[in-house]
Amino acid sequence: SEVEYRAEVGQNAYLPCFYTPAAPGNLVPVCWGKGACPVFECGNVVLRTDERDVNYWTSRYWLNGDFRKGDVSLTIENVTLADSGIYCCRIQIPGIMNDEKFNLKLVIK
């Protein structure tokens, strides 16, 4: 089952996710989505990185940590009850079915 994380309405939520980059100049793309991790990619993508940068995001979502060193933990700003649910952090490791998938449950009080 998913690991559960809690936050209060109006506060920022933190959903941890980490990996170890092979090399600084060659990061692994990561996606965050709302909903459990599907077979491929992320559903309802809220944020995405490429080999160097955050290249897609929606307004209340960001990576506050040092994502270029593998801290791809998601921050959600000013949460509401509607933010409750499962989130998928997917480390998109090259190769067939090599992705690391983490389902995290966010509970808003």
């Epitope: 100049g25 940068d53 955050v54 506050n64």
Partner: antibody
Amino acid sequence: QIQLQQSGPELVTPGTSVKISCKASGYTFTDYYINWVKQRPGQGLEWIGWIYPGSGNTKYNEKFKGKATLTVDTSSSIAYMHLSSLTSEDSAVYFCAGDRFDYWGQGTTLTVSS
Amino acid sequence: QIVLTQSPAIMSASPGEKVTLTCSASSGVSSSYLYWYQQKPGSSPKLWIYSTSNLASGVPARFSGSGSGTSYSLTISNMETEDAASYFCHQWSNSPYTFGGGTKLEIK
């Protein structure tokens, strides 16, 4: 010590193109990104794009796609920026900056005038 | 793209005065990649503060930086003459990387 040495000032006519260089020294050129930044007189800074010399991969600010082309010569540790179809709007100081923006070239002044 | 708004655009301070410059982001950015630069006329920008709060080499201890998410600041505890310059905030976590419009800090 790490240094980024840029080519000298350029005075060119509208419609032409120019190639600015940035010679890196003091580190392994192919291991670190090179960024390019534009600054118009008395104005702020704009990121043009980056190039990773180890692979030749590039990323451009959408605003500069079709205007700037970034390349490298790994044998001489030089990064280049080619600017095409020049207009007066391209008159600016152009800087190269290191991987983490901790080292900057001295800037190349480009003047586009007829 | 993330818009960085600096305020004030221009300010003057007397020697010894405490000065705070702010940088507001239109969306949250990684505090690891929020930088500040000092620039004087005719010179390249100099890295001044990196990763929100770390002073670059040679930067006097009267400077400090703080913030997270969408709100960042640079503070000078006691203004000195040599601090008169333009200061730019910069985020390079989200592509395209962006700079604030700058604050021109003058000495009274």
